[in-house]
Amino acid sequence: LQCYNCPNPTADCKTAVNCSSDFDACLITKAGLQVYNKCWKFEHCNFNDVTTRLRENELTYYCCKKDLCNFNEQLEN
């Protein structure tokens, strides 16, 4: 699986990585002005796990399982 993955929050993440086989999902999350793009585990694609892992209380997130599916426009849909 390929995801956009930036180590630190960034407004427009363009770095694509081949996720290791442990990761079966891509995540994009917006918390305030922070946008996170990550390789992720689908079992952690729920509000509680995302907020805990990102240490953010309020956010919107989108998980998907296709190559490079975690781009900004997905959050706007």
Epitope: N5, P7, N8, V17, C19, S20, S21, D22, F23, Y36, K38, K41, E43, H44, N48, D49, T52, R53, L54, R55
Partner: antibody
Amino acid sequence: EVQLVESGGGLVKPGGSLKLSCAASGFAFSSYDMSWVRQTPKKRLEWVAYISSGGGSTHYPDTVKGRFTISRDNARNTLYLQMSSLKSDDTAMYYCARDGYYAEYYVMDYWGQGTSVTVSS
Amino acid sequence: DIQMTQSPASLSASVGETVTITCRASENIYSYLAWYQQKQGKSPQLLVYNAKTLAEGVPSRFSGSGSGTQFSLKINSLRPEDFGSYYCQHHYGSPLTFGAGTKLELR
């Protein structure tokens, strides 16, 4: 304050079994992935097991696969490592560690004090 | 499995000096690299993750750099409490592997 306290180590004969425990406090244990990492007498660090927050996924290196089993009881805030068919190579200090630092997987931000396992006849 | 090769194995330095420890991965791990410090008789402590992000409470004299397969940890103006062992670890995915460690000793 985050605390991880391991117990259950000791001297065991080759082929024997041992169950390690790690009591967690000071954080929402059920929300965090956890790992066991050991340190050999030569001071090398070796990761031995990982379990996700809900216990749904586990990972092991080939060196312990089929012999070690990681599990957790989120109601008791306790992590376990069941070790069987022990070999002399398993002699080490065993640490439990909290896994998943910020948005990252497999980054261990808190470690226990360790429990010593010696496999010898 | 990804092999992590750390160098040097040991290093002598004086308080106030600057030292650099390197870590090489056997394949591309992007920026998925962490550094830990371990003092004698204690558990490891996280210093850096994502190759260059300092963990909470880590002094700014520590800095990490690199991506892909080549990484380094630099410690500026060594303090007495900085002596001990340092380990790199990739966090790209399982199986996780560590470097063999670098022992930083007081000259």
